[in-house]
């Protein structure tokens, strides 16, 4: 398809040729093209391209362009040739190539497809059935990320209430660029009756740490010392903790934000691997104090999406006073 700009043109290059589109993995869409035929000999060819909504304009010498996009709707790329990197130079007539999502009744596609990366060790995806699906539909989830050679099928399909889901191992690789990438997801049914649904999960978002594990509570004077085990797999700059202390007598509910803290006081079991400690000031030792802790990722490591861990198991210390 040719797309001509409204304005009159001055000395433009011929259009690119053989523009084609293909899909790699699950959601990597690749356009390739050949240089224009009969381009000026004194022209150093550059290619201007943008997506159908005029987004992501790019001027580059390569004869390909790719994008990672969930193929839930049609996406088009327009490409033209020009002789410089100047964005104000008019490119040739733009050639357009589109790719449509797999066919099927849109009402049959699963909805609310989302995934959470649990403790940087496994990914759990869930979805709701589409409106036009039979209750006995057997779903299959496929996934791909850069450290996999091929697309994998998720084996652990489960059902939780209205939601279906599947979980698969996804362990953080030491490679520092691992988390700059995404996991590509597709859900369809075994019989091929429903329209496939796609999602792209950036590995910098939707991260849910495991809950901490409280190891020890102790009093020293009027201070309460709390010691807990941190979730594995995270580096210290990427987590912070919320310590909640409830006092049965005063019915107070104190919340403290805590940086991962070394266990340096003599009251703590010291130098224990992967543990943190915190001193809660001004706690009444002769009353019952109940502590629980949860953890959250730092927005500078993982994009904020309001995901805290579950709360730890509660632990109590002190005596519950008899009500008289």
């Amino acid at each position: 398809d040719y797309k001509d700009d409204d304005e009159s043109r001055t000395e433009t290059q011929p259009p690119v040729t053989n523009l084609s589109v293909s899909v790699e993995n699950l959601c990597t869409v690749i356009w390739t093209w050949n240089p224009p035929e009969g381009a000026s000999s004194n022209c150093s060819l550059w290619y201007f391209s943008h997506f159908g909504d005029k987004q992501d304009k790019k001027i580059a010498p390569e004869t390909r362009r790719s994008i990672e996009v969930p193929l839930n709707e049609r996406i088009c790329l327009q490409v033209g040739s020009q002789c410089s990197t100047n964005e104000s130079e008019k490119p040739s007539i733009l050639v357009e190539k589109c790719i449509s999502p797999p066919e099927g009744d849109p009402e049959s596609a699963v909805t609310e497809l989302q995934c959470i990366w649990h403790n940087l060790s496994y990914m759990k995806c869930s979805w709701l059935p589409g409106r036009n699906t039979s209750p006995d539909t057997n779903y299959t989830l496929y996934y791909w990320h850069r450290s996999l050679e091929k697309i994998h099928q998720c084996e652990n399909i489960f059902r939780e209430g209205q939601y279906f889901g599947c979980s698969f191992d996804l362990t953080k690789v030491k490679d520092s660029s691992f988390e700059q990438h995404s996991v590509q997801i597709m859900v369809k049914d075994n019989a091929g009756k429903i329209k496939p649904s796609f999602n792209i999960v950036p590995l910098t978002s939707r991260v849910k740490p495991d809950p901490p594990h409280i190891k020890n509570l102790s009093f020293h004077n009027d201070d309460l010392y709390v010691q807990w085990e941190n979730p594995q797999n995270f580096i210290s700059r990427c987590l912070f903790y919320e310590v909640e202390v409830n006092n049965s007598q005063t019915e107070t509910h104190n919340v403290f934000y805590v940086q991962e803290a070394k266990c340096e006081n003599p009251e703590f079991e010291r130098n224990v691997e992967n543990t943190s400690c915190f001193m809660v000031p001004g706690v009444l030792p002769d009353t019952l104090n109940t502590v629980r802790i949860r953890v959250k990722t730092n927005k500078l490591c993982y994009e904020d999406d309001k995901l805290w861990s579950n709360w730890s198991q509660e632990m109590s210390i002190g005596k519950k006073r008899n009500s008289t």
């Epitope: 580096i235 210290s236 700059r237 990427c238 987590l239 912070f240 919340v255 934000y257 940086q259 991962e260 803290a261 070394k262 959250k296 730092n298 927005k299 500078l300 904020d304 999406d305 309001k306």
Partner: antibody, heavy 118, light 104 residues
Framework: EVQLVQSGAEVKKPGESLKISCKGS????????IGWVRQMPGKGLEWMGV????????RYSPSFQGQVTISADKSISTAYLQWSSLKASDTAMYYC???????????WGQGTLVTVSS | EIVLTQSPGTLSLSPGERATLSCRAS???????LAWYQQKPGQAPRLLIY???SRATGIPDRFSGSGSGTDFTLTISRLEPEDFAVYYC?????FGQGTKVEIK
């Protein structure tokens, strides 16, 4: 007591380079981020960037990326903010501040006034 | 990029009155990351509130923070003479433009 002590005021000419410092004490310097905040005369606060001295991981605000460099020397508990070529528009008060992982600045340096004028 | 908009720009009140300062985010943010600061002329800012509602160490209880999603509030229940200053909200890389609380 947590303290952040910044280097003294500087007067520079456009095109010159500069490195200002911020020394932390009274806490584990490698366990908290150090951030830099700019305040131009009569204006508000601008988040420039942060460094985690434990592993020297840095993050810059898009507005300051490529304009300044943030570094740290954990052996002397000191963070730095530097320019390779100052401009008159860099004239401002620069604050360093300690940042826990939840992103607020809980302790601040006294500020370093940088004046760039020909 | 998230934008924090503070209102009003200036608040003219008398000592003993209640001050209510607003901070609105351009998109929903986690309350864990919302902080409030006070800055007096010639001084460095001072942290008042973190996590939207937790008072920083040494901050009097007349200062309180509340809110979630896109709307956050700093309340000073009874203004003391030393509370007249500029107040900023912040969420990681973004500060609001400030609200000046001045004596009426």
């Amino acid at each position: 007591e947590v303290q952040l002590v910044q280097s003294g005021a500087e007067v520079k000419k456009p095109g010159e380079s500069l490195k200002i410092s911020c020394k932390g004490s009274g806490y584990s310097f490698t366990s908290y981020w150090i951030g830099w905040v700019r305040q131009m005369p009569g204006k508000g606060l601008e988040w420039m960037g942060v460094i985690y001295p434990g592993d020297s991981y840095t993050r810059y605000s898009p507005s300051f990326q490529g304009q300044v460099t943030i570094s740290a020397d954990k052996s002397i508990s000191t963070a730095y903010l530097q320019w390779s070529s100052l401009k008159a528009s860099d004239t401002a008060m620069y604050y360093c501040a300690r940042m826990p992982n939840w992103g607020s600045f809980d302790h601040w340096g006294q500020g370093t006034l940088v004046t760039v004028s020909s | 990029e998230i934008v924090l908009t503070q209102s009003p720009g200036t608040l003219s009140l008398s000592p003993g009155e209640r001050a209510t300062l607003s901070c609105r985010a351009s998109q929903s943010i986690s309350s864990s990351y919302l902080a409030w600061y006070q800055q007096k002329p010639g001084q460095a800012p001072r942290l008042l509130i973190y996590g939207a509602s937790s008072r920083a160490t040494g901050i009097p209880d007349r200062f309180s923070g509340s809110g979630s999603g896109t709307d956050f509030t700093l309340t000073i229940s009874r203004l003391e003479p030393e509370d007249f200053a500029v107040y900023y909200c912040q969420q990681y890389e973004t500060f609001g433009q400030g609200t000046k609380v001045e004596i009426k």
